[in-house]
């Protein structure tokens, strides 16, 4: 067990041209805070993958207001170290992500707002118990200077915090075969109680008779490098056929449980029992709790009452991410229906609706005919946000209030003459034609293509076909 410690020395503009604008202003004073995420090994994992070695948030720094016209200086930093406790052996190689966050303290609706200012990442080798290592990382135009170290918590010592020390039993020297514990010269290395043959370089134990492996090693005695093991079946074929030096790893060999979790085999895989402060399939997630205030931008922290349980952030509309740190373009979800225009006002979403539609999301198709009467027996027809009247014969106009001239469209064919009539129109056909619209020629022999005209009507008389 031990603690990884991070000391931020400065955060400000990097060297060279293109100095960044100050993140704070007189109108928007702000303050900084930092988040560190640690992962074992030299993995190049996504920023969102679990911080398997642990994570920590700093306190908020002092409030800073930009001096008008002055270049962005190094910004005031929070006091103290960021400390990430680890319960298991220190892996020796690790990846880190350090994020610089800005908390704006202006007149935001809903109080402070947070935004990610810079994120740096790297992969390092580090022995526990060593001196502070200094580092400089750049993110865009920003530069972050920091130091870090890993130290063991008593009684653990050594480069991986796996050796145990105990106070001396005799005042002058350690017992037979036991060395003083550097740098704690007044203590002695505890007697070795690991399984016989357990690799002193790659294995360790916390209970008598066990042999637990550091990352990258496997086998009952932690003597097989994971990368060179060619035993693929759950227990590995015999060494005679594959050249494996030891039986192949079982699900718990090499202890897949991080942070001091204990592994037990299940019929199909393994199960980790995690120590207080860690959770996840492999105890890989560090115990940041709701008390640390991890939810930004008005997010509500749910669960995570103690380090044994995970927290989640329920984000207000408009934000997402595991800590509600990402602003969502809510209009990209196309919430406005029926062609409405979306406006994201920050504190609310507005839809500007097309004619004929209403409602917060333009979801209501207005009844275009409501309260609109069509005169003279016309009927109202809805459509696309406008209404129109289908008028009775002899009437026209938007509301069927205008008396229509049925002859305006010249409906009588072949030179027939049109007469308006109370129930429609009448065509007086030219000689040689007949029909309601004078559309049928009369045959030369006098026979008609249609039934003969009704009695009393000569072919040249006006005809009405109802």
């Amino acid at each position: 067990a031990g603690v990884f410690e991070l000391q931020i020395h400065s955060f400000g503009p990097g060297p060279g041209p293109g100095a960044p604008r100050s993140p704070c202003s007189a109108r928007l004073p702000c303050r900084l805070f930092f988040r560190v995420c640690l992962k074992p090994g030299l993995s190049e994992e996504a920023a969102e993958s679990p911080c398997a070695l642990g994570a920590a948030l700093s306190a908020r720094g002092p409030v800073y207001t930009e001096q008008p016209g002055a270049p962005a200086p190094d910004l005031p930093l929070p006091d103290g170290l960021l400390q990430v406790p680890f319960r298991d052996a220190w892996p020796g190689t690790f990846s880190f992500i350090i994020e610089t966050w800005r908390e704006e303290l202006g007149d935001q609706i809903g109080g402070p707002a947070w935004s990610l200012l810079a994120r740096v990442a790297g992969r390092r080798r580090l022995a526990a118990g060593g001196p502070w290592a200094r580092d400089i990382q750049r993110a865009g135009a920003w530069e972050l200077r920091f130091s870090y170290r890993a130290r063991c918590e008593p009684p653990a010592v050594g480069t991986a915090c796996t050796r145990l020390c105990r106070p001396r039993s005799a005042p002058s020297r350690c017992g037979p075969g036991l060395r003083p514990c550097a740098p704690l010269e007044d203590e002695c290395e505890a007697p070795l109680v690991c399984r016989a043959g357990c690799s002193p370089e790659h294995g360790f134990c916390e209970q008598p008779g066990e042999c637990r492996c550091l990352e990258g090693w496997t086998g009952p005695l932690c003597t097989v490098p994971v990368s060179t093991s060619s035993c693929l079946s759950p227990r590995g074929p015999s060494s005679a056929t594959t050249g494996c030096l030891v039986p192949g790893p079982g699900p718990c060999d090499g202890n897949p449980c991080a942070n001091g979790g204990s592994c037990s085999e299940t019929p199909r895989s393994f199960e980790c029992t995690c120590p207080r402060g860690f959770y996840g399939l492999r105890c890989e997630v560090s115990g940041v709790t709701c008390a640390d205030g991890p939810c930004f931008n008005g997010g509500l922290c749910v669960g995570g009452a103690d380090p044994d349980s995970a927290y989640i952030c329920h984000c207000p509309p408009g934000f997402q991410g595991s800590n509600c740190e990402k602003r969502v373009d809510r209009c990209s979800l196309q919430p406005c229906r029926n062609g409405g225009l979306c406006l994201d006002l920050g504190h609310a979403l507005r839809c500007r609706c097309r004619a004929g539609f209403a409602g917060p999301r333009c979801e209501h198709d207005l009844d275009d005919c409501a309260g609109r009467a069509c005169a003279n027996g016309g009927t109202c027809v809805e459509g696309g946000g406008a209404h129109r009247c289908s008028c009775a014969l002899g009437f026209g106009g938007r509301d069927c209030r205008e008396r229509a001239d049925p002859c305006a469209a010249r409906p009588c064919a072949h030179g027939g003459r049109c007469y308006a009539h109370f129930s429609g129109l009448v065509c007086a056909c030219a000689p040689g034609y007949m029909g309601a619209r004078c559309e049928f020629p009369v045959h030369p022999d006098g026979a008609s293509a249609l039934p003969a005209a009704p009695p009393g009507l000569r072919p040249g008389d006006p005809q009405r076909y109802l």
Epitope: G110, D292, C295, G298, L300, H314, P360
Partner: antibody
Framework: QVQLQESGPGLVKPSETLSLTCTVS????????WSWIRQPPGKCLEWIGY???????NYNPSLKSRVTISVDTSKNQFSLKLSSVTAADTAVYYC????????????WGQGTLVTVSS | EIVLTQSPGTLSLSPGERVTLSCRAS???????LAWYQQRPGQAPRLLIY???SRATGIPDRFSGSGSGTDFTLTISRLEPEDFAVYYC?????????FGCGTKLEIK
Amino acid sequence: QVQLQESGPGLVKPSETLSLTCTVSGGSISSYYWSWIRQPPGKCLEWIGYVYYSGTTNYNPSLKSRVTISVDTSKNQFSLKLSSVTAADTAVYYCASIAVTGFYFDYWGQGTLVTVSS
Amino acid sequence: EIVLTQSPGTLSLSPGERVTLSCRASQRVNNNYLAWYQQRPGQAPRLLIYGASSRATGIPDRFSGSGSGTDFTLTISRLEPEDFAVYYCQQYDRSPLTFGCGTKLEIK
């Protein structure tokens, strides 16, 4: 402006299920989280739980085993069901909208008194 | 859960006076996620302050909020007759959301 109206029976028998509905007007139910809060006569306000249009819910642990809050986006309504009620559940029940900048309550219904009695 | 304790329980004052109401949290309320409400008899609560110090829409500027961490206050600079009501604080830092039990402001 968002307006909320609670509806449901004012009298429920012990051991039965209390059911209330809140109808939202002046705002889309898809824009906010929606919550229920209660206040026993002469006592403190108690948060019951909330729902988001996506179906996300969160309940007060003291009531979690008995509470269900659901949302009906087509009707712009959300509802509360509280099972196995006792006289201690007698209260004015309020529905409220949760603000878009944090989990506080910016609009409230006028409240409906539910009495648990046989 | 965060327990909010409001004091005093009841306060008798006259119109025109200045009043300060206290809300103390059992644990730190991060990010000033604290709101204040006013409840008049027979009515629903009404939002006054959010983010510990931001006034809600339509709230007169005689109402102001302050504080951080575990100690928060609501101040009414000059009491009007309609201000006599019960005032509640509520934290929205973590679940469960919790209210204080209120301070009743009555006319002396």
